[in-house]
Amino acid sequence: SNNKRAPYWTNTEKMEKRLHAVPAANTVKFRCPAGGNPMPTMRWLKNGKEFKQEHRIGGYKVRNQHWSLIMESVVPSDKGNYTCVVENEYGSINHTYHLDVVERSPHRPILQAGLPANASTVVGGDVEFVCKVYSDAQPHIQWIKHVEKNGSKYGPDGLPYLKVLKAAGVNTTDKEIEVLYIRNVTFEDAGEYTCLAGNSIGISFHSAWLTVLPAPGREKEITASPDYLE
């Protein structure tokens, strides 16, 4: 079309939210959808000055076709006013967003209620315990079994006997550590299982019980005393 036109906003609804409070490490996207003829250009200012790539670690992305500015993994120094300037030879329009980067307070790990859940299975069956962990700080996760030693669950110091079954290591992903699988269950596997999650603030843990039933159609097996765990 030959109808020359100064820049104008094409979707003001997407621009109504001027104040953006975003947790640190999140991605921020500001949009200024516009039209005009000839097609306007877009540039961005931070606190009224030209916003250059070197002004932030990791730079930023401008998607001209989407009229957007994208900043990944925001940090406190990203706080400020961001202005899109949209212009062509017939005029210029601008819109300002305010970004506040909220630094979340790291807390001790939160474990999802009800997990791990008590489970029961027959001898020879399989069972899985699931543990969902939420943590701002990087958590370390362990699965622990409460065991007996010389017929006792507690040592002379009054502390329980424990065996670490699974712990997050170099080759273990968070998803892998969140599930404890027990295959071909025996009576010795019955007992208390604990999912423990710790970070730099503290430790949280939830426990669940595994009940082992005799296999159907079989008389209950008489088992010898298990080897005690060191």
Partner: antibody
Framework: EVQLLESGGGVVQPGRSLRLSCAAS????????MHWVRQAPGKGLEWVAV????????YYADSVKGRFTISRDNSKNTLSLQMNSLRVEDTAIYYC?????????????????WGQGTMVTVSS | DIVMTQTPLSLSVTPGQPASISCTSS???????????VYWYLQKPGQPPQLLIY???NRFSGVPDRFSGSGSRTDFTLKISRVEAEDVGVYYC?????????FGGGTKVEIK
């Protein structure tokens, strides 16, 4: 015996730097998060910073952020606090405190063992 | 930040009499694991703080049973059933649920 021993305190002018150290013994240092807490003369306790057992996570009080750096050397069982751009209001006894361990605990998960503290005086 | 408010500021107690210190947090300290992360310390003159009570009501090892902790969510109490001369000092509550860890302003206990 579980012990924490701070050192490096002293008198320093505003704007200058100081490095505090904390020597740990009697426990597996590399398995515990560690904290610094300070106490201005005649005042209450103020948490300063924490570092995770492996040094990968560090958090600071707003009052020291950007000026203080917490670090650790697990091979030497040592915790450090590098204090730059010191201010008069940083004057305090600085305590090294054991934080949460990596494993199951039947007692408190940290903040049970404190050092004797080292005095830092910032004065012109 | 979680604000810990302690009362009273000071307390003068006759030996053998009970004493009670209150602490209020600006947010609940009850965690998803069912524990309440409030700690109590005693700081004697010239010494670092020493842990008395952890996780609301658990006495730390070696702490006399005259000390007890109670409360729920945001309101906490440290009780000394019979105050002894060695109990003098400043008592602090602390929240241990999130950073920044914060302390109450302290309660100075002295003997009449």
């Amino acid at each position: 015996e579980v012990q924490l021993l701070e050192s490096g305190g002293g008198v320093v002018q505003p704007g200058r730097s100081l490095r505090l150290s904390c020597a740990a013994s009697g426990f597996t240092f590399s398995s515990y998060a560690m904290h610094w807490v300070r106490q201005a003369p005649g005042k209450g306790l103020e948490w300063v910073a924490v570092i995770s057992y492996d040094g990968s996570n560090k958090y600071y009080a707003d009052s020291v952020k950007g000026r203080f750096t917490i670090s650790r050397d697990n091979s030497k069982n040592t915790l450090s606090l590098q204090m730059n751009s010191l201010r008069v209001e940083d004057t305090a006894i600085y305590y090294c405190v054991r934080g949460a361990g990596r494993g199951y605990t039947y007692g408190p998960d940290g903040f049970d063992i404190w050092g004797q503290g080292t005095m830092v005086t910032v004065s012109s | 930040d979680i604000v810990m408010t302690q009362t009273p500021l000071s307390l003068s107690v006759t030996p053998g009499q009970p004493a009670s210190i209150s602490c209020t947090s600006s947010r609940s300290l009850l965690h998803s694991d069912g524990k309440t992360y409030v700690y109590w310390y005693l700081q004697k003159p010239g010494q670092p703080p020493q842990l008395l009570i952890y996780e609301l009501s658990n006495r730390f090892s070696g702490v006399p049973d005259r000390f007890s902790g109670s409360g729920s969510r945001t309101d906490f109490t440290l009780k000394i059933s019979r105050v002894e001369a060695e109990d003098v000092g400043v008592y602090y509550c602390m929240q241990y649920i999130e950073a920044p860890l914060t302390f109450g302003g302290g309660t100075k206990v002295e003997i009449k």
